[in-house]
Interface confidence: medium
């Protein structure tokens, strides 16, 4: 007889989960010889360890601890690239500018990117039936508190001038209720890091708007200026044209630096 | 106790390929990654590449990079590795392996070993 | 790809004594070495990852040292079944690569 299970709201867990994080974490730590020390049966059992058995809806930052701790990684001063409600454009960035790092280039993101799980209370058992919604639910999920968790700690530990991607094409440019602006922003330590600069990508080809000069902007200037770390802006009206000169940072069309207009 | 059972001995012809197993038995086979080492008579040891199982993922050695093909059949737990356009100098023992853990980079486990011989 | 050179190529000690074998990489590959141990006719044996850890099971006589390029592995005190066929292996870069050997042989 099936045992009746909770229904949540959500699509429930990413199919293979278990194979997907430990062939991704083989991958990663192959690809990166500074976390080969890492063994992937420790950061798997971590991971479960994190939801499984345990009520979906009341997971907390400190079951991922154990997780964090085995992942724990630092980047570069001046390398932080967040981003915000633009993740394919920083994925791409990413790729070619390979000595700058999203939390997704990072071996815990890189492991959960793009996947779902949850548990249920009590039984060893992962729900690939269905997991909670952050709306619809509760936003104490294994999900969001797993990006909530790693994406602190990945602010927190940035330093020197952090970068951050936003997508201008979005009727909140700066949204307080994403993770940049409810959970990085504000994790930002004044003591390491100098400033922000925020880059505004440009949906429309012809869009020459300022959106620098957008009223979510000035409130995200706002919020870091009070943080006592320095804010600046950029418009980066051509995406497309932005990676080629990524790419080939030569070519005369990228020397002028048309592609982008500076604001501080 | 996990282990790494290796086909038998092999006999082939140049230009002929030869493809050798390695079943796994007592543990998650998916998501071991399995290496692929050869050993000419005398001589040391020859990583030739590695597959994970779970994905079907690939890395060879430049060596080796289009003479051989390592696959996985997870419904067997079985691994493969088949090698192409053999030379006399191919003849060797050919080992599968598999990492701590699931890790890859050092191999904890080993198969017994496949001698094949290349001789026309 | 990185070259793994060990030396000597053939040790002899007698038993109760230590015997100290090298492996030198091309370029550094940080911590990422391992060690294992051959007889004849059978595979290897792993004995040391991470230059110093040791595999389950292998005795505390086992030791590896060092980082970068210059690594070290120790046996304290021989025992007769530790004469074999002693490798390095580095995994810091595709493809690994295996130093060619060091016999360790009855003196």
């Known amino acids: 007889v099936p045992r009746w299970r909770q229904q949540w709201s959500g699509s429930g867990t990413t199919s293979r989960f278990p194979e997907t994080v430990l062939a991704r974490c083989v991958k990663y730590t192959e690809v990166h010889p500074e976390m080969r020390h890492v063994d992937c049966q420790s950061v798997w059992d971590a991971f479960k360890g994190a939801f499984i058995s345990k009520y979906p809806c009341n997971i907390t930052e400190e079951d991922y601890q154990p997780l964090v701790k085995l992942g724990t990684q630092t980047v570069p001063c001046n390398k932080t690239l967040l981003w915000s409600r633009i993740k394919d454009l920083a994925h791409q960035f990413t790729q070619v500018q390979r000595d700058m790092f999203t939390l997704e280039d990072m071996l815990l993101g890189y492991l959960a990117d793009d996947l779902t799980w949850c548990g249920e209370f009590n039984t060893f058992e992962i729900n690939y039936q269905s997991c909670p919604d952050w709306r619809k639910d509760c936003s104490n999920n294994p999900v969001s508190v797993f990006w909530k968790t790693v994406s602190r700690r990945f602010a927190e530990t940035a330093c020197g001038v952090v970068h951050v991607m936003l997508n201008g094409s979005r009727s909140k440019i700066f949204d307080k209720n994403s993770t940049f602006g409810s959970v990085e922003v504000h994790n930002l330590q004044p003591e390491k890091v100098q400033a922000l600069e925020a880059w505004v990508i440009h949906g429309g080809r012809e869009d020459s708007r300022d959106l620098c000069q957008d009223p979510t902007i000035k409130e995200l200037e706002s919020i870091i200026s009070k943080r006592n770390i320095r804010f600046f802006c950029k418009n980066i009206y051509r995406p497309d044209k932005f990676l080629q000169c990524v790419k080939n940072p030569e070519d005369s069309s990228c020397l002028s630096g048309i592609h982008h207009h500076h604001h501080h | 106790q996990v282990q790494l059972v290796q086909s038998g001995a092999e006999v082939k012809k140049p230009g002929s390929s030869v493809k050798v197993s390695c079943k796994a038995s007592g543990g998650e086979f998916s998501i071991y990654v399995i290496s692929w080492v050869r050993q000419a008579p005398g001589q040391g040891l020859e990583w030739m590449g590695r597959v994970i199982p779970s994905t079907g993922d690939t890395n060879y050695a430049q060596k080796f990079q289009g003479r051989v093909t390592i696959t996985a059949d997870e419904s067997t737990s079985t691994a493969y590795m088949e090698l192409s356009s053999l030379r006399s100098e191919d003849t060797a023992v050919y080992y599968c392996a598999r990492g701590k853990a699931y890790y890859s980079g050092w191999l904890a486990i080993w198969g017994q070993g496949t001698l094949v011989t290349v001789s026309s | 790809e990185i070259v793994m050179t060990q030396s000597p190529a053939t040790l002899s000690v007698s038993p109760g004594e230590r015997a100290t074998l090298s492996c030198r990489a091309s370029?550094?590959?940080?911590?990422?070495l391992a060690w294992y141990q051959q007889k004849p006719g059978q595979a290897p044996r792993l004995l040391i990852y991470?230059?110093?850890t040791r595999a389950t099971g292998i005795p505390a006589r086992f030791s590896g040292s060092g980082s970068g390029t210059e690594f070290t592995l120790t046996i304290s005190s021989l025992q007769s079944e530790d004469f074999a066929v002693y490798y390095c292996?580095?995994?810091?870069?595709?493809?690994?690569?295996f130093g060619q050997g060091t016999k360790v042989e009855i003196k």
């Open positions: 292996q580095q995994y810091n870069n595709w493809p690994w690569t």
């Open positions: 370029q550094s590959v940080s911590s990422n």
């Open positions: 991470g230059a110093s």
